[in-house]
Interface confidence: medium
């Protein structure tokens, strides 16, 4: 004969546990139904009646099968430096992540507690390490032969164009200016010179020249921790 199916509430066999999506109620000493995600236990079970579940109220949730008397409160609204990547529903908490241009300086179990703006590398400095969701940008001085003329959290140092005739030599914060339209590959000994790249980046207008003080090998070493303020600007 097939085993009889027990309906909640029921007394478990000695030494056995309740089934999936059931819990053992210590007061009733019975196996009782859990409430589904998005619900909570409004009335606990007795020896003769099963758990009575009710929907979570607005701004509260339960994510798991449960028998909690009250739903959990959703987290506070996302701050201005965050975006809501998961809305508060009856079944899930609100998740806030940092908006573009920011990174998570202090994370929590899900989402971010504190966002901070990504460091911007000033002209003469380029991105050595791009920002991630949880780490800031690292800037580095543009090496001889390269430049950055932007204040940006994404731009790397770019190569100077190589001129047939140089009108204005390039430096760390400005491209070379040519008097001829056809660049050549002639190079000054010891300088780092590169061609214009095949690039999808937009070209920027050039600021007033400023001398490069970057040591010639500063960008060539494997990147370790970098002084946060070097070559960077706040928002």
């Amino acid at each position: 004969l097939p085993a009889q199916v027990a309906f909640t509430p029921y007394a478990p066999e000695p030494g056995s546990t309740c089934r999936l999506r059931e819990y053992y109620d210590q007061t009733a000493q019975m196996c009782c139904s859990k409430c589904s995600p998005g619900q909570h236990a409004k009335v606990f079970c007795t020896k003769t009646s099963d758990t009575v579940c009710d929907s979570c109220e607005d701004s509260t949730y339960t994510q798991l099968w449960n028998w909690v008397p009250e739903c959990l409160s959703c987290g506070s609204r996302c701050s201005s430096d965050q975006v809501e990547t998961q809305a508060c529903t009856r079944e899930q908490n609100r998740i806030c992540t940092c908006r573009p241009g920011w990174y998570c300086a202090l994370s929590k179990q899900e989402g971010c507690r504190l966002c901070a703006p990504l460091r911007k590398c000033r002209p003469g400095f380029g991105v050595a390490r791009p920002g991630t969701e949880t780490s800031d940008v690292v800037c580095k001085p543009c090496a001889p032969g390269t430049f950055s003329n932007t204040t940006s959290s994404t731009d790397i140092c770019r190569p100077h164009q190589i001129c047939n005739v140089v009108a204005i030599p390039g430096n760390a914060s400005m491209d070379a200016v040519c008097t001829s339209t056809s660049p050549t590959r002639s190079m000054a000994p010891g300088a780092v010179h590169l061609p214009q790249p095949v690039s999808t980046r937009s070209q920027h207008t050039q600021p007033t020249p400023e001398p490069s003080t970057a040591p010639s090998t500063s960008f060539l070493l494997p990147m370790g921790p970098s002084p946060p303020a070097e070559g960077s600007t706040g928002d």
Partner: antibody
Framework: QVQLVESGGGVVHPGKSLRLSCAAS????????MHWVRQAPGKGLEWVAL????????YFADSVKGRFTISRDNSKNTLYLQMNSLRAEDTAVYYC??????????????WGQGTLVTVSS | EIVMTQSPVTLSVSPGERATLSCRAS??????LAWYQQKPGQAPRLLIY???TRATGIPARFSGSGSGTEFTLTISSLQSEDLAVYYC?????????FGPGTKVDIK
């Protein structure tokens, strides 16, 4: 540990195309420039192409300019080299190599094992 | 482009002896020079960068020196596993260029 695994090599006729791939693992792929370097049989090393960490800046050796393109898919940790209009002199082992940082001028701290491309009629 | 030359083409050294390899640039590359080791059937491996800085995990018997146009790689006490071709590479000027290599044989 850092691993670079090239694939896509083979025998191809002159004028035809081939696409090489390099699967990267063991490091944060999307913050490093990546390069292709080749080595003809019994010969030395020749730098071929470089792509910046974000894929926006690309550089090529004169010998392949206009025929080869380099690209990357940071979501798949994969580097590509599309080789068109192949010539006999493109026959070589092609290595992908990791740049030491995002700088456009750099040396290579890790190399793949290489994939052989043979261009022959 | 900067042309890199290496000498000798082949170097035969007994185990335990010193091996000295030379690399010359056609114009100054400051100290922007790297050395690579390529064992038979293997990919190149970075040994030295910035002319004299040993890469991670490289034994102390390998050392680099020089700046400008003249560079030297020294293996102070040659081991049998050092049988390889050694390449220098400049990364000061465009395009990146390698030397033709020096093959180190065990006598």
């Amino acid at each position: 540990q850092v691993q670079l695994v090239e694939s896509g090599g083979g025998v191809v006729h002159p004028g035809k195309s081939l696409r090489l791939s390099c699967a990267a693992s063991g490091f944060t792929f999307n913050i490093y420039g990546m390069h292709w370097v080749r080595q003809a049989p019994g010969k030395g090393l020749e730098w071929v192409a470089l792509i910046s960490y974000d894929g926006n800046d690309k550089y090529f050796a004169d010998s392949v300019k206009g025929r080869f393109t380099i690209s990357r898919d940071n979501s798949k940790n994969t580097l590509y080299l599309q080789m068109n209009s192949l010539r006999a002199e493109d026959t070589a082992v092609y290595y992908c190599a990791k740049a030491v940082d995002t700088a456009v001028v750099t040396f290579f701290d890790y190399w793949g094992q290489g994939t052989l491309v043979t261009v022959s009629s | 482009e900067i042309v890199m030359t290496q000498s000798p083409v082949t170097l035969s050294v007994s185990p335990g002896e010193r091996a000295t390899l030379s690399c010359r640039a056609s114009q100054s590359v400051s100290s922007n020079l790297a050395w690579y080791q390529q064992k038979p059937g293997q990919a190149p491996r970075l040994l030295i960068y910035s002319a004299s800085t040993r890469a991670t995990g490289i034994p102390a018997r390998f050392s680099g020196s020089g700046s400008g146009t003249e560079f030297t790689l020294t293996i102070s006490s040659l081991q049998s596993e050092d049988l390889a071709v050694y390449y220098c590479q400049q990364y000061s000027n465009w395009p990146f260029t390698f030397g033709p290599g020096t093959k180190v044989d065990i006598k």
